[in-house]
Amino acid sequence: LRLLDHRALVCSQPGLNCTVKNSTCLDDSWIHPRNLTPSSPKDLQIQLHFAHTQQGDLFPVAHIEWTLQTDASILYLEGAELSVLQLNTNERLCVRFEFLSKLRHHHRRWRFTFSHFVVDPDQEYEVTVHHLPKPIPDGDPNHQSKNFLVPDCEHARMKVTTPCMSSGSLWDPNITVETLEAHQLRVSFTLWNESTHYQILLTSFPHMENHSCFEHMHHIPAPRPEEFHQRSNVTLTLRNLKGCCRHQVQIQPFFSSCLNDCLRHSATVSCPEMPDTPEPIPDYMPLW
């Protein structure tokens, strides 16, 4: 988790002088509770936006937006703490909006936005906006949280972001798999324009199970430049096991931008359909 580096972070708006500061996620009001605290944020919305860095790289960011409730507690609102928690790693990053002037009611509802948390493809986050000061230990909570799922690199807009392109998102191998005689699979895919090797992983499963009954890998050496964008054809021998009939083929490239952590592409071959065997008709009809 990190903040986009592309410009000075601002939270000021007409009628409010505000500055964005790094936060330890442990606001002083936790340690020194105040008697009067503001109410919680209203209508917290998280959306996927995209932003360029100063270097021109494009990153997915969490666009956080919320409004204030129209009650007198805004007189005690000193700022907000924005927290983003990556759920699979428990990594947390916070920033603090520090209000340098008092808020006053005006004809429109106060609205705040922040779009500088860089998020990763195919990750889930919990976004929390805490109004400051935080409540006393038994006080009503004055925060709002929402979960936010970032699409993976198959998503049209995500595909062209720097992290997705670095992991090989622009490569479309267009995998085809056909079953041959004598327990073999023919795998065909399009090579990318880089002289790097590929690894094909074949995992076979029984018809209705998810525990594999066979696994095989095949190495494809780095193609020569004249082979770039050409089709590569590989014949894989299956294990002759009755019922080991559902096959998943994964192709992993080793591009220089992602090395051994590039996006894999896969194709699946289902078990052959079993013809419905009709109920046998008895030779005679019983009378009882």
Epitope: T203, S212, F214, E215, H216, R239, N260, D261
Partner: nanobody, 113 residues
Framework: EVQLVESGGGLVQAGGSLRLSCAAS????????TAWYRQAPGKQRDMVAT???????NYADTLKGRFTISRDNAKNIVYLQMNSLKPEDTAVYYC???????WGQGTQVTVSS
């Protein structure tokens, strides 16, 4: 998460032998394809040997007859026996379980002439 730890590398004279080990924790390897790769300084990581879940093996053409991949399912260890070593075998050797995309940290093998 599957962890792989390679060991057994070192400095050896040309013509000598080494046996590399790759200990896996976090999952059993008996029903998984496994592989050894190597990476010489300034070069790409290259496949050395693979073994599928049925125990069938495959080797890089230049290494056939000198290197042998095997595994001990009870100990959850994959081995690479390297004989008749040559200076061009000098590299960092990595163990790989493709299903989990798990890689070890590598073990350095240096063959002196």
């Amino acid at each position: 998460e599957v962890q792989l730890v390679e060991s057994g590398g070192g400095l050896v004279q040309a013509g000598g032998s080494l046996r590399l080990s790759c200990a896996a924790s976090g999952s059993t390897i008996s029903d998984r394809a496994t592989a050894w790769y190597r990476q010489a300084p300034g070069k790409q990581r290259d496949m050395v040997a693979t073994m599928n879940s049925a125990g069938n093996t495959n080797y890089a053409d230049t290494l056939k007859g000198r290197f042998t991949i095997s595994r001990d399912n009870a100990k959850n260890i994959v081995y690479l026996q390297m004989n008749s070593l040559k200076p061009e075998d000098t590299a960092v050797y990595y163990c790989n379980i493709p299903y989990f995309n798990s890689w070890g940290q590598g073990t350095q093998v240096t063959v002196s002439s």
